[in-house]
């Protein structure tokens, strides 16, 4: 039961995380105009990965896409790539994890196959989360660098006579959404990996069981101790004590073998 809960929770957390990564990637507020210690302007600038926007105080908002690939900074391209890779991996991970969920029965899929799929999706979620966190962090670093550069020359003068308003940008909402979403996807991935260990039908999964001999009729086969204690890999003797040596998860999943899809 605990493994199923861990797997299910990991899936839900990852799903929320990936939805957040997609939202962050699409958002326009990756960087927003810094209003502190700046001349009060009647326009508010903010920028995303795909377009830059200006909201006038009158309420009119105008957005312009970056209709160039070669003219964009390499860092911005790198951030775009990281976010897209994160989304693609996350989406594939979600697809794989749906089939890996213990509560969903597909034909006569072995627990070992579900365990492998759970591990695969978990790793995908971890990498997806790391991609998002990396992408957002690279962009944040770029902002910090540019912020201090523009602070150093806050006003560029023409012979000291004319002042130009230097628009400084600070962290936008999308960065925080991206960080949180990346973190959630990462956590979800870790949970999936933990759930995978509980799903794998290994000898080490068997709990210590006490066996009660009812009379002298019970014959202990030579390989029995070996299998029940978990030492060695004698698969033939694995289910010698089927009546007693079943883990909590096996009990729950047992009827599935006689079920229909």
């Amino acid at each position: 039961m605990a493994v199923t809960a861990c797997q299910g929770l990991g899936f839900v957390v990852s799903l929320i995380g990936i939805a957040g990564i997609i939202a962050a990637t699409c958002m326009d507020q990756w960087s927003t105009q810094d209003l502190y210690n700046n001349p009060v302007t009647a326009v508010f600038n903010y920028q995303g990965l795909w377009r830059s926007c200006v909201r006038e105080s009158s309420g009119f908002t105008e957005c312009r896409g970056y209709f160039t690939l070669l003219g964009l900074p390499a860092m911005l391209q790198a951030v775009r790539a990281l976010m897209i890779v994160g989304i693609v991996l996350g989406a594939i991970g979600l697809l794989v994890s749906i089939f890996a969920l213990k509560c969903i029965r597909i034909g006569s899929m072995e627990d070992s196959a579900k365990a492998n799929m759970t591990l695969t999706s978990g790793i995908m979620f971890i990498v997806s989360g790391l991609c998002a966190i990396a992408g957002v962090s690279v962009f944040a670093n770029m902002l910090v660098t540019n912020f201090w550069m523009s602070t150093a020359n806050m006003y560029t003068g023409m012979g000291g006579m004319v002042q130009t308003v230097q628009t400084r940008y600070t962290f936008g909402a999308a960065l925080f959404v991206g960080w949180v979403a990346g973190g959630l996807t990462l956590i979800g991935g870790v949970m999936m990996c933990i759930a995978c260990r509980g799903l794998a039908p290994e000898e080490t999964n068997y709990k210590a069981v006490s066996y009660h001999a009812s009379g002298h009729s019970v014959a202990y086969k030579p390989g029995g101790f070996k299998a029940s204690t978990g030492f060695g890999s004698n698969t033939k003797n694995k289910k010698i004590y089927d009546g007693g040596a079943r883990t909590e998860d096996e009990v729950q999943s047992y009827p599935s073998k006689h079920d229909y899809v």
Epitope: N45, E56, T164
Partner: antibody, heavy 117, light 113 residues
Amino acid sequence: QVQLKESGPGLVAPSQSLSITCTVSGFSLTSYGVHWVRQPPGKGLEWLGVIWAGGSTNYDSTLMSRLSISKDRSKSQVFLKMTSLQTDDTAMYYCARSLYGNSFDHWGQGTTLTVSS
Amino acid sequence: DIVMTQSPSSLTVTAGEKVTMRCRSSQSLFNSGNQRNYLTWYQQKPGQPPKLLIYWASTRESGVPDRFTGSGSGTDFTLTISSVQAEDLAVYYCQNNYIYPLAFGAGTKLELK
């Protein structure tokens, strides 16, 4: 169609306060900002302040301490309140709607204010 | 505060003539975010409220004749009337719509010879 109409007391004694009302029609105050501009006799235009669609305000720095702009959305009215009036506050007071580029696309006909004892 | 300077203060012209008036701001009105200049031109005839002519320094308001052209960027702006008509006689004001306070220029008065 879009209309703005100012109404005020006309004559006010020095050191008194005044309230001018701008009643709008043809648009919503929740979607557009309304500015106040004055023009002393024979002189140029002077921007006083604005109340934006969201309710935030901005004022001319020299008049900020004496100015207050508010609105009643339900009545489609914008109010300009000014304290400690002096004779040089005598002017034609206009309200105007803000649109693209924060420019003023529609103006009221104006209301004359005379500050005199 | 930002200062808007208009020149000349008055212009005497003949009908059909090309007219150019200038407006200079003490700070740049260019916004890098949308590559627009936040300068507006108004026309005011005697006894009337001002009328919007041009916004974003060069965008003509609908209904404004195409003889009116706005140009310029940053701190220096120009309003050109390609062929002055009798109905164009008025005072022309430029306004900063970028940095508070949204100051107006002193105006350029256009008169007929």
